[in-house]
Every structure is written in structure tokens, then in C-alpha cells.
């Protein structure tokens, strides 16, 4: 069974309007975790919660609160209470198989369906997750590069499946 | 009566919900009308009309159509079409007190409460705008001098000559 | 909109304002000094265009303050040269909003001319 | 220039008080009005004339076009007892009336 997946819920139908209600041109920073792109789900999960919880909030600064409707504020809003969950269910199973990675997270600037696509993807990655011995995978190999291996993509940040 | 009151819709509901789900540091760019910030509205705003026009259409490009509620998609288009249609009556009034200035207008940076504040404004002065045969006040004049006016000196004037 | 700067000077000396805006496009907006003398109404002193390319002034001070600003310090200026008794007064700057006339005015700042 | 009157009056809370002003030449709806309690910079309160600037309460509205402006406020609040000024801006020199002192009766 999945770590934290009672945390949580199914906000697909909520990001897509959210994503749809952003100028697409729009920058949102994040401290994009090395190897998130590379590396299975368990080497950077615990780590990208805790960059995504901060980023959420910072957007969530940059709107009003209005009570009308689905807002993004009112989305945004949501979004931060489901990751500031799971931050806090990394924390109680911080003794579990969940890596922190050794390199320092970069802030980065995402559009709006970038960063969103890694927050569906953090998401899917709780509601998948299972405790595993292995460990030795949360190593990025020296000789891993854009030729040895097809995954990693020299002109994007990640390689993500569209926001659902 | 005002010159294309007709035209103009109540849209400041609409309008006061959509700045609230606009990030507060988007820039938008809006081609700022020589002469706006120091000569009085009648002298720029018919031009600024078609500056909003563009403006808007570029920021309706900015987001997604869904079809869910009044999203941002829906509340620019609306916002696009009395645009349009006050561009369509400044034509049709072009012969009345307009003025058009020579000088091209410049690419500047908005916040949205900005955007919107001018906006609101520039539609507020249509909703008020009476024909007048006075032109002067649409042109600072080097001729303009403690002589002439001893209350004032200027230097540096813009030169933004009255259109027949 | 913090207007600094401000204080005592003898009759023909020289002071400069600073007034530091924030929370909007400042280089949109002309920008305005508007000076009050003890007890008395409001006067325009003097105004500059959002780029800085046009300046105007009253005649009373004409030829002796500047206005001028620094858009990538979003601050104003007024430079006061040959100070008189006269020009004793709360200095403001004001924002001249595009359709709003001064809709935006700082806390002002005291200059006293005496000997 | 611009002529305000009167230059003072004195009023009770809940009067409806109207200040005026003049303008030497027309100045189309190009008058604004503005508030100023002793210290404080002068606030706006309407601008063109008649509209109301954001946060301003209701009962402050403005009226008239060309060269005769009125302000009235419908019913006097104790925070409204300041001097009122009313300015042009259609061209510089920009110009404002002598002020109008609202005190208490």
C-alpha cells in the first residue's frame, strides 16, 4: 500500500482549471530536486513535498481571496492543505524508504502546466509508493548522460505525461 | 450624453474577480499612450481604447477555454468584446473631439490591478465623455511661457498637435 | 510614496527632496511636488512626465527648483536652490494618476527657510 | 483659477453640507476634490467631476461640468470635519481652490 495515500485526494478535475486559469506565460519558481527525472519516486518524494508546500504558498500569496465559485485562490488553497499533509505523513514515516537527496534543491521557473505536472506526478508517486530494501538506486551514475540513457532530456527540466 | 455610453456594458463585478484570480506580479503589457500620463484623458483615449484592445486579446491568448463557470478565458473575451466595440464607435466618432496622438505608442508593464484600473477608467471616461470643440488642451506648446502664463514654465514639451 | 529630505536652511541655501514610491509602475505615472505653507491652502510646485522627458514648473520657483527622478530607483527628486522665506512649507509628492488627478500623496516632508 | 466657497462653515453630525467651486474658465469635468484633517497629506476623494475614488465612502458625491462644481456630503460623519479642496488638472499650472474648513457647531 501506498505511504501517505490516505492523505491524499483527487484534485485532477481541480488542477486542470487551475492550470486552465493561469496565464500560460506565467513563471512559478520551485526548488526542482536533482534527479527527479531520472530517479524512482523514493529518492526525491520526501524532499519535493516540502519544495512544493513552499512554492504553493508563495503563489497562493499573489491572489485575493474571493469567496465566489472555485477560485484559484480557493484551488491553490486546497492544494496547499493536501501537500502540507503529506509533508507532515514524510515526516512520520521519515524512517521508512525515503531518500533525501545529497545535492541541493534548484529553484527553477516553471509555467504553469510544468509545475503542475510535477505536482500531479509528486501526488501520483504517494498514491504509488511502496517500501523497498533497495537503496542503491538514488545514485545519478557520472556516466549517465543524454546518450546512455533516453529518459533525460537535455532541452526540458523533466519529461512528464500532460496534466490529466 | 456621452460619446459610445451605449456601448458600455457594467462589467465590474466581472472585472474585480478576475484581477483577484490574476497572479499579483503578472506583468501585462499595455502600449502606453505618449502624453497620458500628463495631459487629460479626451486627448488620448481613443487611442487608448485600441492599445486596451490589443492588450486584452493578447492576455485572452494567456489562458485556456473551458467551458466551466466564468474562468478568466470567459471574463477577458466578454471584456474583449466591448473593447472592440468601443474601437468601432471611436471610428465612427473619429471626426468628433479625439485626438489621436503622432507620437507611437510605448510597450509598458502593468500589474493587473493596474491594467484593470485603466481599464475601468478609460471605459468610466466614455461613459462621460461630452464633444467639445477645444483642442488646446492636447497640446503643451514651447509657445506656452511665464510670459504668456505666469503661473507656469515648461520645458522639455510634448508636442502632440490636435487631429482635425 | 516616502517623501525625506526635508529641514532647516538659511535664506539663499540649498536643500534636496527625496520622495521613494513603491507598489506601483512608477516610470507610467507623472509625478507632482505640491507644497503647503503653515496654515495656508495648497500650491503645485512642480511636475515631471513618467519618463522624465518633460518638466514643468510654477513661476514661483521657476529657475530655481529642478524636478527630476531616477525610474530604476523608483524615486523622485526636487532639488531647491536660492530658498527663500517664502518657500517655508510642507513639500508632498503626489502621483498624477491618469484620470484621477494626484490620487496618490506621501506624508510629507517639512522645509524651513530662516535665518 | 478657482474660487471655493465658503471658506469656512460649521455643521452637526448628520447634516447634509455642500461646498462649491469655480472655475475662471471652463474646465470640462476636469475637477477633483480632496479632504485634509490637520498633519495628514490630502486624501482624494472624488476625481472627473463626479466619480468617487475607490474606498470612499457613499454619502461623499460630486457634481457639475464646465465652470461650477458642487461636493456635497449627505450626511456629515465626525470624521468628516477637515478642510476640503477642490483642484483642476485639465492643464498645468494645476490649481486648487483656497479650502473649505468643516467644523463642528
Known amino acids: 500500500e501506498g505511504i501517505c495515500r490516505n492523505r491524499v485526494t483527487n484534485n485532477v478535475k481541480d488542477v486542470t482549471k487551475l492550470v486552465a486559469n493561469l496565464p500560460k506565460d506565467y513563471m512559478i519558481t520551485l526548488k526542482y530536486v536533482p534527479g527527479m527525472d531520472v530517479l524512482p519516486s523514493h529518492c526525491w518524494i520526501s524532499e519535493m513535498v516540502v519544495q512544493l508546500s513552499d512554492s504553493l504558498t508563495d503563489l497562493l500569496d499573489k491572489f485575493s481571496n474571493i469567496s465566489e465559485g472555485l477560485s484559484n485562490y480557493s484551488i491553490i488553497d486546497k492544494l496547499v492543505n493536501i501537500v502540507d499533509d503529506l509533508v507532515e505523513c514524510v515526516k512520520e514515516n521519515s524512517s521508512k524508504d525515503l531518500k533525501k537527496s545529497f545535492k541541493s534543491p534548484e529553484p527553477r521557473l516553471f509555467t504553469p502546466e510544468e509545475f503542475f505536472r510535477i505536482f500531479n506526478r509528486s501526488i501520483d508517486a504517494f498514491k504509488d509508493f511502496v517500501v523497498a530494501s533497495e537503496t542503491s538506486d538514488c545514485v545519478v551514475s557520472s556516466t549517465l548522460s543524454p546518450e546512455k540513457d533516453s529518459r533525460v532530456s537535455v532541452t526540458k527540466p523533466f519529461m512528464l505525461p500532460p496534466v490529466a | 450624453e456621452g460619446i459610445c455610453r451605449n456601448r458600455v456594458t457594467n462589467n465590474v463585478k466581472d472585472v474585480t474577480k478576475l484581477v483577484a484570480n490574476l497572479p499579483k506580479d503578472y506583468m501585462i503589457t499595455l502600449k502606453y499612450v505618449p502624453g497620458m500620463d500628463v495631459l487629460p484623458s479626451h486627448c488620448w483615449i481613443s487611442e487608448m481604447v485600441v492599445q486596451l484592445s490589443d492588450s486584452l486579446t493578447d492576455l485572452l491568448d494567456k489562458f485556456s477555454n473551458i467551458s466551466e463557470g466564468l474562468s478568466n478565458y470567459s471574463i477577458i473575451d466578454k471584456l474583449v468584446n466591448i473593447v472592440d466595440d468601443l474601437v468601432e464607435c471611436v471610428k465612427e466618432n473619429s471626426s468628433k473631439d479625439l485626438k489621436k496622438s503622432f507620437k507611437s505608442p510605448e510597450p509598458r508593464l502593468f500589474t493587473p490591478e493596474e491594467f484593470f484600473r485603466i481599464f475601468n477608467r478609460s471605459i468610466d471616461a466614455f461613459k462621460d465623455f461630452v464633444v467639445a470643440s477645444e483642442t488646446s488642451d492636447c497640446v503643451v506648446s514651447s509657445t506656452l511661457s511665464p510670459e504668456k502664463d505666469s503661473r507656469v514654465s515648461v520645458t522639455k514639451p510634448f508636442m502632440l498637435p490636435p487631429v482635425a | 510614496l516616502v517623501e525625506s529630505g526635508g529641514g532647516l536652511v538659511q535664506p539663499g541655501g540649498s536643500l534636496r527632496l527625496s520622495c521613494a514610491a513603491s507598489?506601483?509602475?512608477?516610470?507610467?505615472?507623472?509625478m507632482s511636488w505640491v507644497r503647503q505653507a503653515p496654515g495656508k491652502g495648497l500650491e503645485w510646485v512642480s511636475a515631471i512626465s513618467g519618463s522624465g522627458g518633460s518638466t514643468y514648473y510654477a513661476d514661483s520657483v521657476k529657475g530655481r527648483f529642478t524636478i527630476s527622478r531616477d525610474n530604476s530607483k523608483n524615486t523622485l527628486y526636487l532639488q531647491m536652490n536660492s530658498l527663500r522665506a517664502e518657500d517655508t512649507a510642507v513639500y508632498y509628492c503626489?502621483?498624477?494618476?491618469?484620470?484621477?488627478?494626484?490620487?496618490?500623496w506621501g506624508q510629507g516632508t517639512l522645509v524651513t527657510v530662516s535665518s | 483659477q478657482m474660487t471655493q466657497s465658503p471658506s469656512s462653515l460649521s455643521a452637526s453630525v448628520g447634516d447634509r453640507v455642500t461646498i462649491t467651486c469655480r472655475a475662471s474658465q471652463g474646465i470640462r469635468g476636469y475637477l477633483g476634490w480632496y479632504q485634509q484633517k490637520p498633519g495628514k497629506a490630502p486624501k482624494l476623494l472624488i476625481y472627473?467631476?463626479?466619480s468617487l475614488q475607490s474606498g470612499v465612502p457613499s454619502r461623499f458625491s460630486g457634481s457639475g461640468s464646465g465652470t461650477d462644481f458642487t461636493l456635497t456630503i449627505s450626511s456629515l460623519q465626525p470624521e468628516d470635519f477637515a478642510t476640503y479642496y477642490c483642484?483642476?488638472?485639465?492643464?498645468?499650472?494645476?490649481?486648487f481652490g483656497q479650502g473649505t474648513k468643516v467644523e463642528i457647531k
Open positions: 472627473s467631476a463626479s
Open positions: 503626489a502621483r498624477r494618476d491618469f484620470f484621477a488627478h494626484f490620487d496618490v
Open positions: 507598489g506601483f509602475t512608477f516610470s507610467s505615472y507623472a
Open positions: 483642484a483642476e488638472y485639465i492643464r498645468m499650472p494645476y490649481t
